[in-house]
Amino acid sequence: AILGRSETQECLFFNANWERDRTNQTGVEPCYGDKDKRRHCFATWKNISGSIEIVKQGCWLDDINCYDRTDCIEKKDSPEVYFCCCEGNMCNEKFSYFPEMEVTQPTSNPVTPKPP
């Protein structure tokens, strides 16, 4: 780590559209990027009637919105698709939803992607 920063070298990978995109459904993704760029992990998901459906998880490149975030937390109020990003290996394994404007229970990730 540089100046105490958590280096991201790999992230949990998931793709709900794996069949159409011809990718693996789940796994570990190595994160690459230019030396002067920071690397992050991300997760995107939907909340459909209280059921969490993961859309994608993987690596995300140098985004100031992700700097120094050790936890993957969505803070936007009721987005159509939830997004969070973080720094640190596999930090996107767990993700949660804490809207900034109101106090609610977090929506943690209860989902283990099922194999095809």
């Epitope: 559209n17 995109d21 990718t23 690459y32 990027g33 995107t44 919105n65 698709v81």
Partner: antibody, heavy 120, light 107 residues
């Protein structure tokens, strides 16, 4: 300095084939996804195909699926686009472009392009 | 496929003007939105990625905003070298798709 240099374009008859190449330098080629994007004369940009860092994942636009094949040779730092059954509507400048991660496909470096003309 | 709609298709502006270009996606693309600048006879150049992140070497007068379906590229004070065509592009899912472009011309 990142450089991408396309070659292989030219005039071909409808139904013919061409193979485009993109020679990469100035970065660790084997660590990046790569893409082909085309631009018909006077028109906008159209993504053609993409391939992840190790060639394990490939994606194609519907307009070229089954006719074009993207591939890469990481030992030669080269990206390829094999184009078969070419049509007049494939006439365009073809750019190779470097992507980031498979899920984070912003194209941060582009080649200068190579012109493909399909005409009888 | 996700459709990307840019507006306006062209605009005329003067040096020093504040210019805003909008891009709308046919479904939520979260923050998977990139902006490119292209000058005649040249390859496109990345300007903004992930909706708000400034690409390397791009002047700070360029900024991006938005999430979900609606996005904006703003040039705070237009410079002579900024006259070009600008494209948005989504990377939320394959196939990657581009907007139709916005041509920024000199008034």
């Amino acid at each position: 300095e990142v450089q991408l240099l396309e070659s292989g374009g030219g005039l071909v008859q409808p139904g013919g084939s061409l193979r485009l190449s993109c020679a990469a330098s100035g970065f660790t080629f084997s660590s990046y996804s790569m893409n082909w994007v085309r631009q018909a004369p006077g028109k906008g940009l159209e993504w053609v195909a993409g391939i992840n860092y190790n060639g394990g994942y490939k994606g194609y636009a519907d307009s070229v699926k089954g006719r074009f094949t993207i591939s890469r040779d990481n030992s030669k730092n080269t990206l390829y686009l094999q184009m078969n059954s070419l049509r007049a509507e494939d006439t365009a400048v073809y750019y190779c472009a470097r992507g980031a991660n498979w899920h984070d496909t912003h194209l941060d470096y582009w080649g200068q392009g190579t012109l493909v003309t399909v005409s009888s | 496929d996700i459709q990307m709609t840019q507006s306006p298709s062209s605009l005329s502006a003067s040096v020093g003007d504040r210019v805003t270009i909008t891009c709308r996606a046919s479904q939520s693309i979260v923050r998977y939105l990139n902006w490119y600048q292209q000058k005649p006879g040249k390859a496109p150049k990345l300007v903004i990625y992930a909706a708000t992140s400034l690409a390397s070497g791009v002047p700070s007068r360029f900024s991006g905003s938005g999430s979900g379906t609606d996005f904006t590229l703003t040039i705070s004070s237009l410079q002579p070298e900024d006259f070009a065509t600008y494209y948005c592009q989504q990377s939320y899912e394959l196939p990657l798709t581009f907007g139709g472009g916005t041509k920024v011309e000199i008034k």
